[in-house]
């Protein structure tokens, strides 16, 4: 066969679907690789061909579109499973071609099993809700295109194993799940099961997402530097190790980049000749507020180093703050016989 533009295996699109459920998979060529859509390609006389490689096999084979009840079918740029089976797992290739043009891409499809509590190896999307923020909703994801708008599916919501009914502050409303006032106890995995009829058969779509209750923007504040502060003085003798922690609290802010850095005499540590190391640790509260600690360390401090200005800086979407550490050289303890005696006028 003539040359084909092969985009390889698109592992970015690791598609996971549940066993014994319908799945509709769009050819990634039109979404990520080509600058035209399927309709344009079809109008130009290009044909979309599907084939696959079974799990743990090397042999590419055509997809069998003649299975009973059209279990696998193709519609435009979509490959349909009605429903999937466990052994449908493999790498699928869609190829767009005519006599003069060819482009193809492969992608992995994994059919996964779930237990009666919807636990599975499926990677779950995370939806963040603000704590005590008023009514917030999550929507049953990725169910578009499975049934026409004339079909009215039944939707059942679960938290873990349990059907959501009579919960304190969570109300199922069709495709939406409303949280009247989100609390830490609402953290967890939520599943919608969408049941719809098609050609005399009943299909189920299971979608699970993780809800994480996070700090509310109503309570968000600019970064707070807990250390260094005015109460602690870093008093060292030359040759000792100087350790100064910079500890900063950041309120949770959606999509905010939290930054902490030190300057020494107004310069970044990388830009000066001192032998300084900085170690960072990060911890999170239950609502994803963040505490970052950067410890500035100089193994053997010199008297010059003890005269420098050490400033901790912090920045988030809420603002920027800075705080200087109080560093000074320890005055050597007086030697009694000489210094104190002189002080008392002894000769």
């Amino acid at each position: 066969s003539e040359r084909c533009d092969d985009w390889g295996l698109d592992t970015m699109r690791q598609i996971q679907v549940f066993e014994d459920e319908p799945a509709r998979i769009k050819c990634p060529l039109f979404e990520h690789f080509l600058k035209f859509n399927y309709s344009t390609a079809h109008s130009a006389g290009l044909t979309l061909i599907w084939y696959w490689t079974r799990q743990d096999r090397d042999l590419e084979e055509p997809i069998n579109f003649r299975l009973p009840e059209n279990r696998i079918s193709k519609e435009k740029d979509v490959l349909w499973f009605r429903p999937t089976l466990l052994n449908d797992t493999g790498n699928y290739t869609c190829m767009l071609r005519n006599t003069t043009y060819c482009s193809k891409v492969a992608f992995p499809l994994e059919v996964v099993q779930k237990d009666s509590c919807f636990n599975s190896p499926m990677k779950l999307p995370v939806h963040k809700l603000y704590i005590e923020y008023g009514i917030q909703r999550i929507t049953c994801p990725n169910v578009d295109g499975y049934f026409p708008s004339s079909v009215k599916p039944t939707i059942t919501w679960y938290m873990g194993c349990y059907k959501i009914q009579n919960f304190n502050n969570v109300i199922p409303e069709g495709m939406n799940l409303s949280f009247l006032i989100a609390l830490i106890s609402n953290n967890g995995n939520y599943t919608c099961v969408v049941t719809y009829p098609e050609n005399g058969r009943t299909f189920h779509l299971t979608r699970t997402l993780t809800v994480k209750v996070v700090g509310s923007p109503k309570n968000a504040v600019p970064p707070v530097i807990h250390s260094p502060n005015d109460h602690v003085v870093y008093e060292k003798e030359p040759g000792e190790e100087l350790l100064i922690p910079c500890t900063v609290y950041f309120s949770f802010l959606m999509d905010s980049r939290n930054e902490v850095w030190w300057t020494i005499d107004g310069k970044k540590p990388d830009d000066i000749t001192i032998d300084v190391t900085i170690n960072e640790s990060i911890s999170h509260s239950r609502t994803e507020d963040e505490t970052r600690t950067q410890i500035l360390s100089i193994k053997k401090v010199t008297s010059e180093d003890l005269k420098r200005s050490y400033v901790c800086h912090a920045r988030s979407a809420k603002g920027e703050v800075a705080k200087a550490a109080k560093v000074k050289q320890k005055v050597p303890a007086p030697r009694y016989t000489v210094e104190l005696a002189c002080g008392f006028g002894a000769t």
Partner: antibody
Framework: QVQLVQSGAEVKKPGSSVKVSCKAS????????IQWVRQAPGQGLEWMGY????????DYAQKFQGRVTITADESTSTAYMELSSLRSEDTAVYYC???????????????WGQGTLVTVSS | EIVMTQSPATLSVSPGERATLSCRAS??????LAWYQQKPGQAPRLLIY???TRATGIPARFSGSGSGTEFTLTISSLQSEDFAVYYC?????????FGQGTKVEIK
């Protein structure tokens, strides 16, 4: 090790209500579902319903809808089952049992209370 | 609701012998099945969950098998303390339902 301790035996008149308590000691209470099961004399086990204290969610078997109320008090780690409009066929031993956590698909009942005999008699 | 049917209703076995108890579901319950043992005047005790996993502290002579609609509890060598009533229970679909029980008695 978690233990479930139930309230004592009750004798009730037909048409009245009974409220049985189930106190958890020695471990987590909120994150588990507390299930209620009954057993009439010489009969098998019959699931009645559950409550999940942490989120307040509950569900009842169809047979008991409208007559049973299951509640929980997290502060005292106690669950309650109230059955109203009692009739003679409600004479049974009522058990509370710990179901698994929200995410454990082994939703079997691994820890049981000692049972509370409720006798309905005029 | 799913109906669980146990057989036989009564099983007469001599100590040291093997006992095989059967449980059938009216529709598939996958592997979401538990077995309980109940002695007179006591609460039930969990033996097996997930159709075949022994609960904590349950002796190895108890084993469970099956999936879908057909399940078996086997007691490989009956001890005197094993004479009791055994219940199966499905937890695949609400409401959770129990079988009517199998009484294992001394022959």
């Amino acid at each position: 090790q978690v233990q479930l301790v139930q309230s004592g035996a009750e004798v009730k008149k037909p048409g009245s209500s009974v409220k049985v308590s189930c106190k958890a000691s020695g471990g987590q209470f909120s994150e588990y579902a507390i299930q209620w099961v009954r057993q009439a004399p010489g009969q098998g086990l019959e699931w009645m319903g559950y409550i999940i204290p942490t989120v307040g969610g509950f569900d009842y078997a169809q047979k008991f809808q409208g007559r049973v109320t299951i509640t929980a008090d997290e502060s005292t780690s106690t669950a309650y089952m109230e059955l109203s409009s009692l009739r003679s066929e409600d004479t049974a031993v009522y058990y509370c049992a710990r179901g698994q956590t929200l995410y454990d698909s082994g939703r079997q009942f691994d820890i049981w209370g000692q049972g509370t005999l409720v006798t309905v008699s005029s | 609701e799913i109906v669980m049917t146990q057989s036989p209703a009564t099983l007469s076995v001599s100590p040291g012998e093997r006992a095989t108890l059967s449980c059938r579901a009216s529709q598939s319950v996958s592997s979401n099945l538990a077995w309980y043992q109940q002695k007179p005047g006591q609460a039930p005790r969990l033996l097996i969950y997930g159709a075949s996993t022994r609960a904590t502290g349950i002796p190895a002579r108890f084993s469970g098998s099956g999936s879908g609609t057909e399940f078996t509890l086997t007691i490989s060598s009956l001890q005197s303390e094993d004479f009791a009533v055994y219940y199966c229970q499905q937890y695949n679909n609400w409401p959770w339902t129990f079988g009517q029980g199998t009484k294992v008695e001394i022959k």
